[in-house]
Interface confidence: low
């Protein structure tokens, strides 16, 4: 075209993808009649006629633009709707009269990329690798033109650095003409980078100016050798026998080394490996005083086969030994005195208490209990409790039975029992004394004795109610070396009118019981005995 070299730079029109571009033909009236104009698109230096204006009327040419062009502003402006990246080219209008002149417009198209998507390398990166390793990948989809990417570590931009930082970016063109940018950050990392925050930033331009979008921050797994291993004990604080104690190894490497826990044998002073669970934790449950001692942890790095040892840690499992009471089985006459002494060993200072077993009453705070002017009632159980006040729950106890010499003492002297003929009675009689008494009955039947405690005995008797038995009644006699004593059971026939609704049950046994510590009580139920077999 003659004189093309002198053509002024094309007018710049900037629009976003999807919007409408207004292409205003800048020919003056002297350069051409705007009622007679041809519009061309120029792509790779090839002109294509896309629109004609004749007598102010517009007509699209068949082709890629025919559905998207229209005339505005009394014919001076061509509107291109739904702009795509492929529309970024030169458009020109050419006036036909009085002589052929043209006006060029450069259309620039923009589209903000989507939020950048960052993916960290989940496989991790070893420190001191021979070459930069993949840290993360940043993807910015559907932008136009190609956005610029900047990588940041801990808020500071990263620059290419030979053998240290390498940024590898590539782009693909989608069918829409938009670009998807992929940028891979490769770096040589050090141990301190285990907590480093990486992110990428996309810089792009719109008609309104420059903009940027940031990805989320990510950390990358960093593999680094262990420099230190140490032991941790749970629970913290004072330990006692019976506790569940966990001893675990910890390390400052990633991944952690393979751990083993050893305890020093107090005899040989040799470290002996302990058996840990599948998580490498040594569980002492229940902890015993023998678990006390010096523990250490060994961490073996399987990559380097370097072994590291922790500082040894002393473990103290506090204990209270078995409690010993002297005398162990005291016997005293009524009116005499008795001194009970309690002993125990512990890893800590001990506190002693004496309690009455039957009532729980505290009698003495200290290892020695003195009892004076002993009565029969003073016989029975006394408990010594040895405890460590600084460690709640750490205590041991011992029960001692004090025996007061005396003749048998009956739970009741006499009582009435309601019965029916032919029923089987289950009678009981209880006595105490020291030495422990034995019980005999004045009637034949099946008797059995049970020792209730060192001074107390309970005898039960099963007997058939007969007219003779009703007449004689039943006596139980308790005797020991120091004397004897008797209880009498009076048997009374039940009238039918006094029967309770369930007193004719055929399964129960009549019982009559009493105890020195409870009020005597007696219940009766009957059991029919089988009739003798009749012989024909």
């Amino acid at each position: 075209v003659p004189g093309e070299a002198e053509q002024p730079a094309p007018e710049l029109v900037e629009v976003e993808v999807g919007s409408t571009a207004l292409l205003k033909c800048g020919l003056s009236q002297s350069q051409g009649n705007l009622s007679h104009v041809d519009w061309f698109s120029v792509h790779k230096e090839k002109r294509t006629l896309i629109f004609r204006v004749r007598q102010g009327q517009g007509q699209s040419e068949p082709g890629e633009y025919e559905q998207r062009l229209s005339l505005q502003d009394r014919g001076a402006t061509l509107a291109l709707t739904q702009v795509t990246p492929q529309d970024e080219r030169i458009f020109l209008c050419q006036g036909k009269r009085p002589r052929s002149q043209e006006y060029r417009i450069q259309l620039r198209v923009y589209k903000a990329p989507e939020e950048p998507n960052i993916q960290v390398n989940p496989l991790g990166i070893p420190v001191n690798s021979k070459e930069p390793e993949e840290v993360a990948t940043c993807v910015g989809r559907n932008g136009y033109p190609i956005p610029q990417v900047i990588w940041y570590k801990n808020g500071r931009p990263l620059k290419e650095e030979k053998n240290r930082v390498h940024i590898q970016s590539s782009q693909t063109v989608e069918s829409s003409g938009l670009y998807t940018l992929q940028s891979i950050l490769k770096a040589q990392l050090v141990k301190e980078d285990k907590d480093a925050q990486f992110y990428c930033e996309l810089n792009y331009r719109l008609p309104s100016g420059n903009h940027m979008k940031e990805s989320r921050e990510v950390t990358v797994p960093v593999f680094y050798p262990t420099e230190k291993v140490w032991l941790e004990v749970e629970p913290v604080g004072m330990l006692k026998e019976g506790d569940r104690v966990e001893i675990r190894c910890l390390a400052d490497g990633n991944p952690p080394p393979h751990f083993s826990i050893s305890k020093q044998n107090p005899s040989t002073r040799e470290a002996e490996e302990e058996t840990t669970n599948d998580n490498g934790v040594l569980v002492l449950e229940p902890a015993r005083k023998e678990h006390s001692g010096r523990y250490e942890c060994q961490g073996l790095d399987l990559d380097t086969m370097i072994s590291l040892l922790s500082e040894p840690q002393e473990l103290l499992v506090n204990y209270v030994s078995d409690v010993r009471v002297s005398p162990a089985a005291p016997e005293r006459q009524e009116g005499s005195s008795l001194t009970l002494t309690c002993e125990a060993e512990s890893s800590q200072d001990l506190e002693f208490q004496w309690l009455r077993e039957e009532t729980g009453q505290v009698l003495e705070r200290g290892p020695v209990l003195q009892l004076h002017d002993l009565k029969r009632e003073a016989g029975g159980g006394y408990r010594c409790v040895a405890s460590v006040p600084s460690i709640p729950g750490l205590n041991r106890t011992q029960l001692v039975n004090v025996a007061i010499f005396g003749p048998p003492w009956m739970a009741f002297k006499e009582r009435k029992v309601w019965v029916k003929e032919n029923m089987v009675l289950n009678l009981s009689c209880e006595a105490s004394g020291h030495p422990r008494p034995t019980i005999s009955w004045n009637v034949n039947g099946t008797a059995s004795e049970q020792d209730q405690d060192p001074q107390r005995v309970l005898s039960t008797l099963n007997v058939l109610v007969t007219p003779e038995l009703l007449e004689t009644g039943v006596e139980c006699t308790a005797s020991n070396d120091l004397g004897k004593n008797t209880s009498i059971l009076f048997l009374e026939l039940v009238n039918l009118t006094t029967l309770t609704p369930d007193s004719n049950t055929t399964t129960g046994l009549s019982t009559s019981t009493a105890s020195p510590h409870t009020r005597a009580n007696s219940t009766s139920t009957e059991r029919k005995l089988p009739e003798p077999e009749s012989r024909g």
Partner: antibody, heavy 121, light 111 residues
Framework: QIQLVQSGPELKKPGETVKISCKAS????????MNWVKQAPGKGLKWMGW????????TYADDFKGRFALSLETSASTAYLQINNLKNEDMATYFC??????????????WGQGTSVTVSS | DIVLTQSPASLAVSLGQRATISCRAS??????????MYWYQQKPGQPPKLLIY???NLESGVPARFSGSGSGTDFTLNIHPVEEEDAATYYC?????????FGSGTKLEIK
């Protein structure tokens, strides 16, 4: 000795949920990751994802994002695979495999015996 | 994703002879001097068993008749001499990047 023992076979209806367990013994559970691999009847092996037993962080292959969840019960040295909203194409044997990963190594060195999941209406 | 192409799909080898299985990756699985290629053996009804790690290292307890070689994109598993118990399906697998992928498998029969 090192063992991975998986839970027994499962028969489920479409839309139901299944949770497979993989109990590890004989090694320190938190020193190794755990991979999960799918094998459809008569087909090859397909990697589903892995879970970092030290941090509890799961990573999934694209085809197994959404309905699939990897989890741990570290105190019991057990890893779990849960599949929600079961579909017919989930019918397969699922393997857990210990992940020997460190600075220079990423191997699946010990495998569970596999758990067969049948999906049938 | 890295695609692993195994060949042949199946092969029959006489007892005592050599079996060679090939695995080609769609891009390099080597970095920092290491090749992240692994070989597994699977028998019917059993889980896979690791044979070779990092392309050429024999896993502990695996017989020395198994060997692996290769780097970059081309890898080979050799079994020599083949024994009756080697009848199985063999898979290659990479762990260069996520996702890990397996080859489609090679079924070895013993003649």
């Amino acid at each position: 000795q090192i063992q991975l023992v998986q839970s027994g076979p499962e028969l489920k209806k479409p839309g139901e949920t299944v949770k497979i367990s993989c109990k590890a013994s004989g090694y320190t559970f938190t020193n190794y990751g755990m991979n999960w691999v799918k094998q459809a009847p008569g087909k090859g092996l397909k990697w589903m994802g892995w879970i970092n037993t030290y941090t509890g962080e799961p990573t999934y292959a694209d085809d197994f994002k959404g309905r699939f969840a990897l989890s741990l019960e570290t105190s019991a040295s057990t890893a779990y695979l849960q599949i929600n909203n079961l579909k017919n194409e989930d019918m397969a044997t699922y393997f857990c495999a210990r992940y020997r990963y460190n600075k220079y190594e990423r191997a699946m060195d010990y495998w569970g015996q596999g758990t067969s999941v049948t999906v049938s209406s | 994703d890295i695609v692993l192409t195994q060949s042949p799909a199946s092969l029959a080898v006489s007892l005592g002879q050599r079996a060679t299985i090939s695995c080609r990756a769609s891009k390099s699985v080597s970095t920092s001097g290491y090749s992240y290629m692994y070989w597994y053996q699977q028998k019917p009804g059993q889980p896979p068993k690791l044979l070779i790690y990092l392309a050429s290292n024999l896993e502990s307890g695996v017989p020395a008749r198994f060997s692996g070689s290769g780097s970059g994109t081309d890898f080979t598993l050799n079994i020599h001499p083949v024994e009756e118990e080697d009848a199985a399906t063999y898979y290659c697998q990479h762990s260069r990047e996520l996702p890990f992928t397996f080859g489609s498998g090679t079924k070895l029969e013993i003649k």
